[in-house]
């Protein structure tokens, strides 16, 4: 269970991928779309809201085989708007909603090696939010194999 | 409850290296990374590095890199950080630390091993 | 690399005296920053994680305050097992870094 319903801080960040291409969003036909693209020098960087709250449960509970605490986010680039994951499709797509936030609407989140993160998603274990052709995508992460795939990699700066 | 159990006392020559272990009982040992913090007599707290059980992955303070080495045994939940060519400076009480929250190191560091100390003497 | 610069380096007190310890950190941390109590021979303990949160098991007089690059700890109401060398962290990015550390002495 998340501990309270408020976050334990939030941040305004950018966010792109290993290789440095940024994460925007855009609004076409009254939705968002959200890409995966090299940015023109000059053109300021998207920013989301991430919303960081603390998870507690017991493996028991959880499944996960986590028995402690886990940092939980969601991300949000426009007021009402938050990605969440659509496991059906394995893609990755902004969704208005009121809170309380849905369970899609929510990722652990990993620190990784580079001082880069990954998000996993809280509604599948081992799927992580990736790129995929220029698109982020859900991407299922085989826990025999290292998780410091590169798609799966993103940078956070403020 | 959480444990985690440091190898012994060292005592080493300049230019030598030291090899020290941390066994980890009492949670899932992959979910968590792992930390080498030292501390010289007398001195504040120094962050050597981190490691990465589940696939071994390492990331240094550029202070160490080349003379540290941290590595993994999944099968005994242990992790090892090895330290060459060590000098007078390298004097220290050296600690693994595990981080509060899976996966993650924002919300700090709050199991700490009783720590070993390493003596360089010639 | 992320500079933490702790004052004072020492503050001399007496029991019933309220403490604050400020650490600056060199560029924005957002709100990763974690404080530690240290008493000799010892491991360092986890007082206050994400910069106000109070770790478990911790008591109320203890806590912590600020976000970006300036943060408080303070002791409310100094009691004799607080006398100790209190360290704070920055936990956003590689490597992690720690201040030079504060130690309360009895006055």
């Known amino acids: 269970s998340i501990t309270g319903i408020s976050p334990i801080t939030e941040s305004l960040a950018s966010l792109s991928t290993y290789n440095d291409q940024s994460i925007t969003f855009a609004l076409e036909d009254e939705s968002y779309e959200i890409y995966v693209e090299d940015l023109k020098k000059d053109k300021k960087k998207d920013k989301v809201l991430l919303s960081y709250y603390e998870s507690q449960h017991p493996s028991s509970e959880s499944g996960d085989g986590v028995d402690g605490k886990m940092l939980m986010v969601t991300l949000s680039p426009t007021k009402d708007f938050w990605l969440q994951a659509n496991n059906k499709e394995h893609s990755v797509e902004l969704h208005k909603c009121e809170k309380p936030l849905p369970d899609q609407a929510f990722f652990v989140l990993h620190n990784r090696s580079f001082n880069c993160v990954s998000f996993e998603c809280k509604t599948d274990p081992g799927v992580f939010i990736g790129v995929k052709d220029n698109h982020l995508a859900l991407i299922k992460v085989d826990y025999s194999e290292n998780l410091g795939s590169e798609n799966i990699l993103f940078k956070l700066s403020e | 409850q959480v444990q985690l159990v440091q190898s012994g006392a060292e005592v080493k020559k300049p230019g030598a290296s030291v090899k020290v272990s941390c066994k980890a009982s009492g949670y899932t040992f992959i979910s968590y990374g792992m930390h080498w913090v030292r501390q010289a007599p007398g001195q504040g707290l120094e962050w050597m590095g981190e490691i990465n059980p589940h696939g071994g992955s390492t990331s240094y303070a550029q202070k160490f890199q080349g003379r540290v080495t941290m590595t993994r045994d999944t099968s005994t939940s242990t992790v090892y950080m090895e330290l060459s060519s060590l000098r007078s400076e390298d004097t220290a009480v050296y600690y693994c630390?595990?981080?509060?929250?899976?996966?993650?190191?924002?919300?700090?560091?709050?199991?700490w091993g009783r720590g070993t100390l390493v003596t360089v003497s010639s | 690399d992320i500079q933490m610069t702790q004052s004072p380096s020492s503050v001399s007190a007496s029991v019933g005296d309220r403490v604050t310890i400020t650490c600056r950190a060199s560029?924005?941390?957002?709100?990763?920053l974690a404080w530690y109590q240290q008493k000799p021979g010892k491991a360092p303990k986890l007082l206050i994680y994400a910069a106000s949160r109070l770790q478990s098991g911790v008591p109320s007089r203890f806590s912590g305050s600020g976000s970006g690059t300036d943060f408080t700890l303070t002791i409310s109401s100094l009691q004799p097992e607080d006398f100790a060398t209190y360290y704070c962290q920055q936990a956003n990015v590689f490597p992690l870094t720690f201040g030079g550390g504060t130690k309360v002495e009895i006055k």
């Open positions: 560029q924005g941390i957002s709100s990763w």
């Open positions: 630390a595990r981080p509060s929250a899976a996966y993650s190191h924002y919300l700090g560091i709050d199991m």
